[in-house]
């Protein structure tokens, strides 16, 4: 602790100019004071001035008023500094002396004589308020006031708390009257050395080095560092933790760039046709009658469905068609015949059977022929039997479907997983992509099928910290760290929410 006992002398009265022994001063009492401050004593005794002592120069003769003086000799109030915790009690002895000698240093003069002395014992709290008192004896009167104040940078009721205002990286504060710290705006913590970050800045994922700042830790972004950064190259995906790529609905693949729902995203099928997804970026359009083309974008001629029977020729009209019937046939579709079996109406070896008592007939066609008169060669591809873009081919009495890569089955209706063949060596993970399978290799292997042993393993150097698991082949850096709970960062190097430590103090 550290403080100052201050004594202000105000007026001394010794009208008769007498000494304590009854003698008078000639020509008058040239008066100076000796002050002794010590610990509280119920009965004041001689002995060391434990709290300090001070003497004044000659302040006046006999009776006089003492003016305040801030510097030099004769300073008033008198200062008695101490370097300990103020106990709250004290004993004070004020002696008035006459000197025949030097005005400025009367202490050193021989022949000094006591005029009077007063003793004060009691309690005194630290404070700015002066306590005023007056002491009389038969010959003299002394008016004075006193107080105890703390030295600069000392605070509290006993001046025991040291506090120095500060504005540097070890603290940003001012001192309260009790010596506690009052943080400057924008700062917090026991020593006001912790900045208050931008309001809302994420506690774990953001930090600041000065007030109203929000600096993101690796893997986080946004004004408040509350948005994770997804895996580099993530196209149609999001993250809930950094470096993740969780695919949006309808997307797949490591980087969520494989379209699994082309029909919904692109609506490729026109004219009310039905769209069916068939793997990444694959789809098939099933056309309504009257349309054709890969996307059912082509409108068919009204005659395209061959509505005219018995070899009738079809002619397109604005919203309809017209059948020109061959001799022996009539009706809208030439469906009625004036022929009988006698006219040998069945072609290509068809057998004629009479009906309705010989007034009409029906042809029974040999294999590969059809039509009322067996006049048409059967085209087994007209029903578009091949799914998923397969090509239909007539093969004599039958037809076959030639499937696109990735499909199989009689009608190309089955989707082949490229990964079914387990193309990835050395425990690599297989991903079905549009252009074929892609392998994600375990540590120590690379190549399209993980067939190449890496001499330098990116994980071999142990780039991941705090017990994280290392994977290669997932990122441009050749490795990705999977962090354990409580750690973040591209190498799991940042602890989440660091607890303050409590180092030793003396």
């Amino acid at each position: 602790g550290s403080g100052i006992f201050q004594l202000r002398l105000q007026e001394f009265v010794n009208q008769r100019g007498m000494l304590a022994n009854g003698q008078s001063c000639e020509p008058g009492c040239r008066t100076f004071f000796r002050i002794c401050l010590k610990h509280f004593q119920a009965t004041f005794s001689e002995g060391p001035c434990t709290f300090g002592n001070v003497s004044t120069p000659v302040l006046g003769t006999n009776s006089f008023v003492v003016r305040d003086k801030n510097s030099g000799s004769g300073r008033n109030p008198l200062q008695l500094p101490f370097n300990f915790t103020w106990p709250g009690t004290f004993s004070l002895n004020i002696q008035a002396w006459h000197t025949p000698g030097d005005d400025l240093r009367p202490e050193t003069s021989p022949g000094n004589s006591l005029i009077s002395q007063i003793i004060i014992q009691g309690s005194l709290a630290v404070g700015k308020i002066w306590r005023t008192d007056e002491q009389n004896d038969t010959l003299t009167r002394l008016s004075y006031s006193y107080r105890v104040i703390c030295s600069d940078n000392y605070y509290g009721e006993s001046c025991s708390r040291l506090c120095k205002k500060r504005d540097d990286h070890f603290g940003h504060y001012e001192c309260q009257p009790d010596g506690s710290l009052s943080c400057l705006p924008g700062w917090t913590g026991k020593y006001c050395d912790q900045p208050i970050c931008l309001s809302g800045c994420h506690e774990q994922n953001g930090y600041c080095s000065k007030p109203d700042e929000c600096i993101c830790r690796p893997g986080w972004q946004g004004r408040l560092c509350n948005e994770c950064i997804p895996h580099n190259g993530c196209r149609h995906g999001t993250c809930s933790i950094p470096w993740q790529c969780a695919c949006d609905e309808g997307w797949g693949g490591l980087f969520c760039d494989q379209d699994l729902n082309y029909c919904t995203h692109h609506s490729p099928c026109k004219n009310g046709s039905t769209c069916s997804n068939s793997g990444p970026k694959g789809y098939t359009c099933t056309c309504l009658p009257g349309y054709t083309g890969e996307h059912c974008e082509l409108g068919l001629s009204k005659c395209a469905s061959n509505p005219c029977r018995n070899g009738g020729s079809c002619k397109d009209q604005e919203n309809s068609y017209h059948c020109l019937c061959p001799p022996g046939y009539y009706g809208q579709h030439c469906e009625h015949s004036t022929l009988t079996c006698a006219d040998s109406p069945c072609f290509n070896g068809g057998s004629c059977r009479e009906r309705n008592q010989g007034s009409s007939y029906a042809c029974e066609c040999p294999p590969n022929f059809t039509g009322s008169n067996c006049e048409k060669k059967v085209d087994r591809c007209t029903s578009n039997p091949c799914a998923n873009g397969g090509q239909c081919q007539n093969r004599g009495p039958s037809r076959t479907c030639r499937c696109r890569p990735g499909f199989t089955g009689t009608h190309c209706e089955l989707h082949i997983s490229d990964c079914a063949r387990s193309p990835c060596a050395h425990g690599g993970t297989c991903h079905d992509l549009e252009n074929g399978p892609v392998c994600t290799c375990p540590a120590g292997f690379s190549g399209r099928r993980c067939e190449v042993r890496i001499t330098h393993d990116a994980c071999a150097s142990g780039p991941c910290f705090n017990g994280a698991t290392c994977y290669t082949g997932l990122s441009p850096n050749n490795f990705v760290c999977n962090c354990p709970y409580g750690f973040v960062g591209s190498r799991c190097e940042f602890p989440v929410g660091l607890p303050p430590s409590f180092p030793w103090v003396a």
């Epitope: 120095k164 990286h169 070890f170 603290g171 600041c208 080095s209 303050p500 430590s501 180092p503």
Partner: antibody
Framework: EVQLQESGPGLVKPSETLSLTCTVS??????????WGWIRQPPGKGLEWIGD???????YYNPSLKSRVTISVDTSKNQFSLKLSSVTAADTAVYYC?????????????WGQGTLVTVSS | EYVLTQSPDFQSVTPKEKVTITCSGQ??????ASWYQQKPDQSPKLVIY???KRPSGVPSRFSGSNSGDDATLTINSLEAEDAATYYC?????????FGQGTKVEIK
């Protein structure tokens, strides 16, 4: 017990960059109670404060060296580093790393043993 | 630029004697002063922080004070093991500043 250990080349050519690393063991460099500083002492002379760093990366440098000094921190390795560019013979000194304690009002309670760096061609 | 000046530069003292080293700087009393002891070929060691406090393990004969423009390190009853160079240190804003050092030698 906290320990600090300086490492780096003992000889650097004039005009090149001096690089030193201080490895902290027995305590976390990420504690909010400490700054991590560099101090140097030319042979037969007194101590000169170079600069310090907080675990978040905030740095403070001696104005007389500021244009040439870079201090960085790697919390994952519990290390902090000093780079001093364009060195001359006047930069020959024992370089110390130290822990500056907020609770001790900036007093440095732990020091490395120091490493002598000589600048000479 | 803030400057700390120590006096004396050198002091030769007999054992059991009292040693006083002064560190002066403009309004130094408004800053916290630390004192370091450095023996030959050793790192500095903190002996006083926050003007007058001793870290654990530092003998009670070491004491410090700081007011006005002067901080003082006092070694009461010097012992042979106290022979060293002593440095005062304070912070001026965000910059650490050391005094030039005082070498204490045993007579």
């Amino acid at each position: 017990e906290v320990q600090l250990q300086e490492s780096g080349p003992g000889l650097v050519k004039p005009s090149e960059t001096l690089s030193l690393t201080c490895t902290v063991s027995g305590g976390s460099i990420s504690s909010s109670s400490y700054y991590w500083g560099w101090i140097r002492q030319p042979p037969g002379k007194g101590l000169e404060w170079i600069g310090d760093i907080y675990y978040t990366g905030s740095t403070y440098y001696n104005p007389s060296l500021k244009s040439r000094v870079t201090i960085s921190v790697d919390t994952s390795k519990n290390q902090f580093s000093l780079k001093l560019s364009s060195v001359t013979a006047a930069d020959t000194a024992v370089y110390y790393c130290a822990r500056e304690d907020v609770i001790l009002r900036g007093g440095s309670d732990y020091w490395g043993q120091g490493t002598l760096v000589t600048v000479s061609s | 630029e803030y400057v700390l000046t120590q006096s004396p530069d050198f002091q030769s003292v007999t054992p059991k004697e009292k040693v006083t080293i002064t560190c002066s700087g403009q309004r130094l009393g408004d800053k916290y002063a630390s004192w370091y002891q450095q023996k030959p070929d050793q790192s500095p060691k903190l002996v006083i922080y926050e003007d007058s406090k001793r870290p654990s393990g530092v003998p009670s004969r070491f004491s410090g004070s700081n007011s006005g423009d002067d901080a003082t390190l006092t070694i009461n009853s010097l012992e042979a093991e106290d022979a060293a160079t002593y440095y005062c240190q304070a912070w001026d804003r965000d910059t650490g500043v050391f005094g030039q050092g005082t070498k204490v030698e045993i007579k």
